[in-house]
């Protein structure tokens, strides 16, 4: 999902030395930067949550805001500390003048300063409810674990918790954070309050509608009557659900966010400490027919991030909006017209759709999953997610075009059976953000801290690009895609997958001398190929043609253009092997691929050769897709005939484990 | 531990008014409503309706309306039931249980209706 | 409404005995159906929720089955304590009903 270097607005205000002794410079005389919410509507002028550097204890935070209150008040500026963050991010939200801020920015600890801004709860339309009539009851659903060792916790509006399809499944907490309803006239009808919150706790765990029917759940306060929330808030009930964990230990934990604002860092930022912390996150994409990484906490790569669709697996339209897309997404799920309970009455059953319902639905099938197996880990709860949807049902023309590729094709579904997938070798396709369109542009494309990467891919539709590799970034290796001169710019795709006990390197080959191409291969003793990569510094590697097919008795073997430098990823780990598939097509053709067969994970997709015609290749479930120029402007040369390459791997180790425990 | 504790038993004339209370302990008020449940004497049980601890909601059975009120007072935890224009056949004990899930019930309040 | 039958209205037998009681819903009920246990002068006690599953602390000589409109309760060895009156009730729709009760005795 969405890099460091998001879509947001930022602005970094420049550290001068006219300041007046009252502040310490920055640690290393780096800059903090203040970020604001892109959509002007959403943002919250004069309320700021100032973000300390990772290691800053409490005590330095309370002085920092003391001591920015104090320079505050010598300039004649009242300032209020509305809260100090601890446990989950260290820094405080404070109520000040914009004029205090380039102040604040040169405070000791600031790593940077972000304003408040609004989230909103994404159901349409959640508070004028069609009401079904209150005998109605969903088609019988009897999961075989209901999620019963599993706790989710809502933030949203608040709910009515003795409701029958949720009472005694919910506790309401004491945590309540939202801002003033909008408007003079604005009259707080309890039912209304409830409506949004009601419906979601209905649908994850309602004894009759619910996806999780023994799931207990916790809600804070979020969002108020009118749906509506700040960033600030939802920092705030994250924080207090850390705190809870570290107070009480229990199982494994859900928090769902049916909201979402503008891009914000910090949600982000918090998402993630949550998310390392051992908690599964799950948010709506959002309700604005636009790209998910635009906003928050749907742009957070350590949350799951929901898209919604129909009863016919096509996106929902909303109005004049709908569900969001894009990289950000990790898969869709039901979210319309999705019957729940209703606060008109304690028996009352009401249809909402939007992708709170969405992403409620998958927080009741991540309730199951954990339930049947508590120790997943977020990774593997994702892949496996992603590996039980249901592939290639969703209808893409009504994503715009350039979405098309980077929205994934997945509607949500329960497993077969809720143990025994743990044999598979599960990957997933990561896509980075767009580069850019500047010569030296690059784009990254990260697996998450547990996963391994296995294998990398480009892809530009102008066709102008210059490869990707694999490069160790952090001590973790990352997907590099770059761009080439006059090349609109490019996406780096990573195949991320749960190897267990893997040890994988990058075996590299620099550009050939002869002109039978380059070559690469994993020599190691042990070590398998699970992915090709090419990158060149030429603009244009022109029509030279390597020998597609690898010698005989050679599979774990890479070969590319000889003006590109070759890059085989090379892993060992209990168990695991793998082979090659090729499909060539000896006339143009804008796409060719080639799948694993049953039993046979996709780790690695690239294409053959790495001319200039070719748009890039990438991974589609199990399928390897390279993409070229149209065909009308390629003509039919012998330039034309590209060979998509797949590696599948399996894992013996992973089945003779499965095996054992069953 | 989760408990209802009712009022103790009533004897009322025909024509009059009867209100049982039932206390909540034990366990989060207003994750539960309570439902009344009475039985005549030698007879089955019949449920009466239901209120919410959470907002003060009720749904009363068909049989009910309009002789019954059900109230609560959410800072002491109490639950009430008022029964106006009582009859012979209103004789009952009649019992308080949580939720719709009626898995925890009060001890019964005996109420007799005679001339 | 619906309506909860349940068969036989009352049955003896020794201590050590299988006994089964069964409730017939009016119509399908799906498995929201309830069995309380009650003695004399006391409240109702919750014995079996949905159909099925043992509420907690009830011996596991009691026992649910059924769904849609027929239900078993059963008693798999009939204990002195167990002598009372059972009641099925459904929990799938408003108003919730009862069964006439079934009235276990000492033979």
């Known amino acids: 999902q969405e890099d460091e270097d998001g879509d947001y607005e930022e602005l970094v205000l420049a550290l001068r030395s006219e300041e007046d002794g009252l502040a310490e410079a920055p640690e290393h005389g780096t800059t903090a930067t203040f970020h604001r919410c892109a959509k002007d509507p959403w943002r919250l002028p004069g309320t700021y949550v100032v973000v300390l550097k990772e290691e800053t204890h409490l005590s330095q935070s309370e002085r920092t805001a003391r001591r920015l209150q104090a320079q505050a008040a010598r300039r004649g500026y009242l300032t209020k500390i509305l809260h100090v963050f601890h446990g989950l991010l260290p820094g405080f939200l404070v109520k000040m003048s914009g004029d205090l801020l380039e102040l604040a920015l040169k405070l000791p600890h600031v790593d940077y300063i972000e304003e408040d801004s609004s989230v909103f709860a994404q159901s349409i339309p959640w508070n004028l409810e069609r009401i079904t009539p209150p005998r109605y009851r969903a088609d019988e659903y009897q999961p075989p674990d209901g999620g019963s060792l599993v706790e989710v916790y809502l933030l949203d509006t608040s709910i009515q918790s003795d409701h029958r399809e949720i009472e005694g499944r919910v506790m309401v907490t004491d945590f309540e954070n939202v801002p003033e309803e909008d408007g003079t006239r604005f009259h707080r009808q309890a039912s209304k309050c409830d409506s949004h919150g009601t419906h979601l706790a209905g649908v994850v765990s309602g004894r009759d509608a619910g996806v999780a029917k023994g799931a207990s759940m916790r809600s804070l306060r979020v969002l108020n009557c009118q749906g509506k929330g700040t960033v600030s808030g939802t920092l705030i009930g994250l924080e207090f659900i850390r705190k809870s964990q570290l107070v009480q230990p229990v199982g494994p934990l859900v928090v769902l966010l049916p909201l979402a604002g503008g891009y914000s860092r910090v949600l982000n930022a918090a998402c993630q400490r949550l998310a390392r912390a051992g908690v599964v996150l799950v948010t709506a994409a959002g309700n604005f027919r636009d790209d998910a990484c635009l906003y928050s906490p749907a742009s957070a790569p350590e949350v799951i991030t929901v898209g919604a669709t129909n009863a016919q697996d096509q996106p929902v339209t909303l109005g004049t909006l709908g569900t969001n897309f894009g990289r950000c997404v990790d898969l869709f799920a039901p979210g319309e017209d999705i019957i729940g309970a209703s606060s008109d009455c304690s028996t009352c059953f009401v249809s909402q759709s939007g992708t709170s319902q969405a992403a409620a639905h998958v927080a009741g099938i991540a309730a199951m999953m954990l339930s049947a197996e508590p120790e997943l880990t977020l990774a593997e709860l994702r892949q496996r997610l992603i590996h039980f949807s249901a592939k290639d049902v969703i209808n893409e023309a009504w994503f715009p075009e350039d979405q098309r590729v980077l929205t994934p094709n997945l509607v949500a579904a329960l497993p077969p059976s809720t143990h025994g997938a743990g044999w598979q070798l599960f990957c997933r396709t990561v896509w980075s953000a767009h580069s850019g369109p500047t010569r030296m542009a690059t784009a990254v494309a990260r697996c998450a801290p547990d996963e391994e990467l296995l294998s990398c891919s480009s892809f530009s539709r102008s066709g102008k690009r210059r490869g990707e590799r694999m490069e160790a970034q952090g001590g973790k290796l990352v997907c590099r895609a770059h761009n080439a001169f006059g090349g609109e710019g490019v996406y780096a795709i990573a195949r991320c997958c749960l190897l267990p006990q893997a040890n994988c390197s990058v075996h590299t080959a620099p550009p050939a001398e002869a002109s039978m191409g380059t070559r690469v291969h994993c020599h190691q003793q042990g070590h398998v190929l699970t992915g090709c990569s090419s990158h060149w510094e030429v603009e244009d590697l022109g029509t030279h043609k390597p020998p597609v097919l690898r010698p005989r008795g050679q599979p774990n073997q890479c070969v590319g253009h000889r003006e590109a430098s070759i890059h085989a990823s090379c892993c060992h780990a209990p168990g695991l092997e793998c082979k090659v598939k090729e499909h060539g097509i000896p006339a143009p053709q804008e796409q060719v691929t080639v799948a694993c067969e049953e039993g046979w994970t996709l780790t690695g997709c690239s294409a053959l050769p790495g001319t200039s015609h070719v748009l890039g290749a990438y991974a589609v479930d199990n399928t390897c897709v390279v993409r070229s120029r149209d065909v009308s402007t390629t003509g039919s040369t012998s330039e034309g005939a590209v060979t998509a390459v797949a590696i599948c791997c399996r894992s013996r180790h992973l089945a003779q484990a499965s095996q054992e425990l069953q | 531990q989760v408990q209802l504790v009712q009022s103790g038993a009533e004897v009322k004339k025909p024509g009059a008014s009867v209100k049982v209370s039932c206390k909540a302990s034990?366990?989060?008020?207003?994750?539960?409503?309570i439902s009344w449940v009475r039985q005549a004497p030698g007879q089955g049980l019949e449920w009466m309706g239901w209120l919410s601890f959470y907002n003060g909601n009720t749904n009363y059975a068909q049989k009910l309306q309009g002789r019954g009120t059900m109230t609560t007072d959410p800072s002491t935890s109490t639950a009430y039931m008022e029964l106006r224009s009582l009859r012979s056949d209103d004789t009952a004990v009649y019992y308080c249980?949580?939720?719709?899930?009626?898995?925890?019930w009060g001890q019964g309040t005996t109420v007799t209706v005679s001339s | 409404d619906i309506q909860m039958t349940q068969s036989p209205s009352s049955l003896s037998a020794s201590v050590g005995d299988r006994v089964t009681i069964t409730c017939r819903a009016s119509?399908?009920?799906?498995?929201?159906l309830d069995w309380y246990q009650q003695k004399p002068g006391k409240a109702p006690k919750l014995l079996i929720y949905?159909?099925?599953t043992l509420e907690s602390g009830v011996p596991s000589r009691f026992s649910g089955s059924g769904s849609g409109t027929d239900f078993t309760l059963t008693i798999s060895s009939l204990q002195p304590e167990d002598f009372a009156t059972y009641y099925c009730q459904q929990d799938n729709d408003i108003p919730l009903t009862f069964g006439q009760g079934t009235k276990v005795e000492i033979k």
């Open positions: 249980a949580r939720g719709y899930s009626l898995d925890v």
């Open positions: 119509q399908s009920v799906r498995n929201w």
């Open positions: 034990g366990y989060t008020v207003t994750s539960y409503g």
């Open positions: 949905g159909a099925s």
